[in-house]
Structures are given as C-alpha cells and as structure tokens.
C-alpha cells in the first residue's frame, strides 16, 4: 500500500488571510509616506506631479462600496506590479540626486515585492481565478534631466501612497462583509 494520506488540507480563514495582507499593505503605506516626506524635504514639490506611464488611480474606477474581492485583488496586483517596475526604474535611471533616498528606496522595492507575493498567495488560497501573465511592458524612457527624475519620484511615491490607501480601505471594507 502507498503512503498514508496526508492530513486534510485546512481551508484558509479568509478573514485571517485578508488580515495579514492588510497588515503588509499598511506597513508599506507607512514606509511610502515616510519616503515621500523625505523626498519633499530634500526636493520640495511644486504642485501635483504626473507620469503618464503610471496606472490611473484605482479609486476612480468606482465607489468602494461596490467592489468585490476578486476585482480588488486583481486590480491591486496589476497596479502594484506597475509601481514595482517604476521604483526599479527610478533606482536605476533616477540620477545621482535620488541616490540620497537609498537605502530606503531599496527597502521600499523589497516590501512592494513581498506584498505582491502575498497577494498572489492570497488569490490562490482563496481559489480566485489567476490573472493571465502580464505582457512585457515597454521599457520606461530615462528622465530627460535630473529634475525630471525628481518629478518622477514625486509622482511615483504620491501615486503609490494613494493606491495603498485605496487598498487598505477596500480590503478592510471587504473583510466586514466576509
């Protein structure tokens, strides 16, 4: 006879799974806020900065109250992948001025990567349909100047901050419905 069957797979508690994802998201939100403040202190921002390659804010996609878990997780994962790519690009091409934001920018990248893996795990544990692999994104053009790199950093950290807030609010709201 073959080996004895393993213990039955315990179905995960979705509230606990969501909890640990919210914790990571909140932690990353605090890191992002701190880094954005650091950037503002060193290079004060004049008004809003935008970067066309960044995802449009998820919160404009509709009222939070109408969201469903698969939609939130899929959208959040896609947006965070884009931000991860932008943070990597910033570290690589942002110029010497942004070197003053190391090692914090590197830590942010690592935590962003960790949250993405956590979201992937959450989606598989909750048996949500996995999104298709992302098509390769066109490379981001290097900033036109040192100031261009700084403006891009303001846009990336500001957008990430708002996206993470949307995520925390959406996930906690969904948790109340489980």
């Amino acid at each position: 006879p073959g080996p004895p069957p393993g213990p039955p797979r315990v179905s995960p508690d979705p509230r606990a799974e969501l909890d640990s994802t919210v914790l990571l998201t909140r932690s990353l939100l605090a890191d992002t806020r701190q880094l954005a403040a650091q950037l503002r202190d060193k290079f004060p921002a004049d008004g809003d900065h935008n970067l066309d390659s960044l995802p449009t804010l998820a919160m404009s996609a509709g009222a939070l109250g109408a969201l469903q878990l698969p939609g939130v997780l899929t959208r959040l994962r896609a947006d965070l992948l884009s931000y991860l790519r932008h943070v990597q690009w910033l570290r690589r091409a942002g110029g010497s001025s942004l070197k003053t934001l190391e090692p914090e920018l590197g830590t942010l990248q690592a935590r962003l990567d960790r949250l993405l893996r956590r979201l992937q795990l959450l989606m598989s544990r909750l048996a949500l349909p996995q999104p298709p692999p992302d098509p390769p994104a066109p490379p981001l053009a290097p900033p036109s100047s040192a100031w261009g790199g700084i403006r891009a950093a303001h846009a990336i950290l500001g957008g990430l901050h708002l996206t993470l807030d949307w995520a925390v609010r959406g996930l906690l709201l969904l948790k109340t419905r489980l």
Partner: antibody, heavy 119, light 111 residues
Framework: EVQLVQSGAEVKKPGASVKISCKAS????????MDWVKQAPGQRLEWIGD????????IYNQKFTGRATLTVDKSASTAYMELSSLRSEDTAVYYC????????????WGQGTTVTVSS | DIVLTQSPASLALSPGERATLSCRAS??????????IHWYQQKPGQAPRLLIY???NLASGVPARFSGSGSGTDFTLTISSLEEEDFATYYC?????????FGQGTKLEIK
C-alpha cells in the same frame, strides 16, 4: 497653521436633511482622508465614515449607510457631510477630522457643528 | 464591531500626581508589532485632540509627560505628573478593523 473650519449650528425638523461643510487649510488637502465623527450628548464618539479627497467612493460605518453622504470639492479644499431623514437621536455635535491614510487616527479636528433635531 | 471599555469611568487626582488610564478591547487590536490604538483628550466645548497614535507614538506638540503602552487587548495612557490643564476627558480609539470605534471615556477631575 493647519485648520479645519466647519459651518455653523443647525436646527432641523424630523425628516429633514442637513449638510455640514468643513474647509481645510494649511496642508495639502489630498494628502489625508477626511473623516466625520458624531458626538451625541452622553454617548461615546461614533465614526460616521471617511472620504479620500483624491477621488473614489467614501466608506461608511454601516450604521450610517444610506443616510450619510460624504462629498468633497477638491478645488475649494472643502469636505461635506449630508445627513438625511433626521430624527431626534441625530441631535449631536458633528466633527470633521483629518485622517491619516490607511490608519484612521485623527490628528486635526474641526471645531464641531451642533445639529439639533426638534419638532 | 470591536468594543473598547475604559476604566475607571472617572478619576480624581491632584496636580503633580501620576495618572494611569486603562482601555480594554473586546478582541486583539495588535498585529505583528503594530497596535492600532489611539488616545485623545477632550475638554468641555472643545473638539478632541490627538495625544498618542499607534499605542505609543506621541502626537505632534503633545508634552512628554503623556505616554502610551500596551498590546493585544490591554492599553494604558499614563500622565507622569499632572498639570492643571490635563484635567479633561480621555478617549481611546481603535483602527484595527472597520469601523473604528471609541471607548466611553475616562473623566479626570481635580481632587
């Protein structure tokens, strides 16, 4: 100086609606959420809901869903809370408060708006 | 919803004394090193004022005689040496889940 200035006291009849404004100054309006808190006489403080001025839907305490409506006018750095179908138990002081994104602690408060519901 | 219970309901002390205010949550409001409890002070006719956020962080402009501690379900606000202006009502609030809720308050009175 960071400030939230609310509209004046209101007296309303049962069944009516009230809309309170909250004008923010001294900080970047879109960097924080705007939360609303109720303080009825002899009752504990109650969170009504919040809104991110950058856009998207507000979120509400289930107890107030359907009766409270939170909106913002980003260009005027002003938040609004409308409460409909008023009843006597809505008599309270209503505060707007600046909320830290993702953490729901409130580091700046408006002076409060007293709403009295009486026939 | 998470229920916060504060004790005592009122406390009479003299200036210079140490005040210890307690807040107990109906379930844990801590996760992996973060405790989502915040403390406010409110004086009659005024709005609440943030004193402590995330259990132990002193809010901007708050004197160092105020401190917060605790984790899990039990939290404490300590005022090391009471000043005249500290006599007020104190509220704890959690933000572990939605909706955030407040305790019923502890009234600190002059003896």
């Amino acid at each position: 100086e960071v400030q939230l200035v609310q509209s004046g006291a209101e007296v309303k009849k049962p069944g009516a609606s009230v809309k309170i404004s909250c004008k923010a100054s001294g900080y970047t309006f879109t960097d924080y959420n705007m939360d609303w808190v109720k303080q009825a006489p002899g009752q504990r403080l109650e969170w009504i809901g919040d809104i991110n001025p950058h856009g998207g839907g507000p979120i509400y305490n289930q107890k107030f869903t359907g009766r409270a409506t939170l909106t913002v006018d980003k260009s005027a750095s002003t938040a609004y809370m409308e409460l409909s179908s008023l009843r006597s138990e809505d008599t309270a002081v209503y505060y707007c408060a600046r909320g830290e994104l993702g953490h729901w602690y409130f580091d700046v408060w408006g002076q409060g708006t007293t709403v009295t519901v009486s026939s | 919803d998470i229920v916060l219970t504060q004790s005592p309901a009122s406390l009479a002390l003299s200036p210079g004394e140490r005040a210890t205010l307690s807040c107990r949550a109906s379930k844990s409001v801590s996760t992996s090193g973060y405790s989502y409890i915040h403390w406010y002070q409110q004086k009659p006719g005024q709005a609440p004022r943030l004193l402590i956020y995330l259990a132990s962080n002193l809010a901007s402009g708050v004197p160092a005689r105020f401190s917060g501690s605790g984790s899990g379900t039990d939290f404490t606000l300590t005022i090391s040496s009471l000043e005249e202006e500290d006599f007020a009502t104190y509220y704890c609030q959690h933000s572990r889940d939605l909706p955030p809720t407040f305790g019923q308050g502890t009234k600190l009175e002059i003896k």
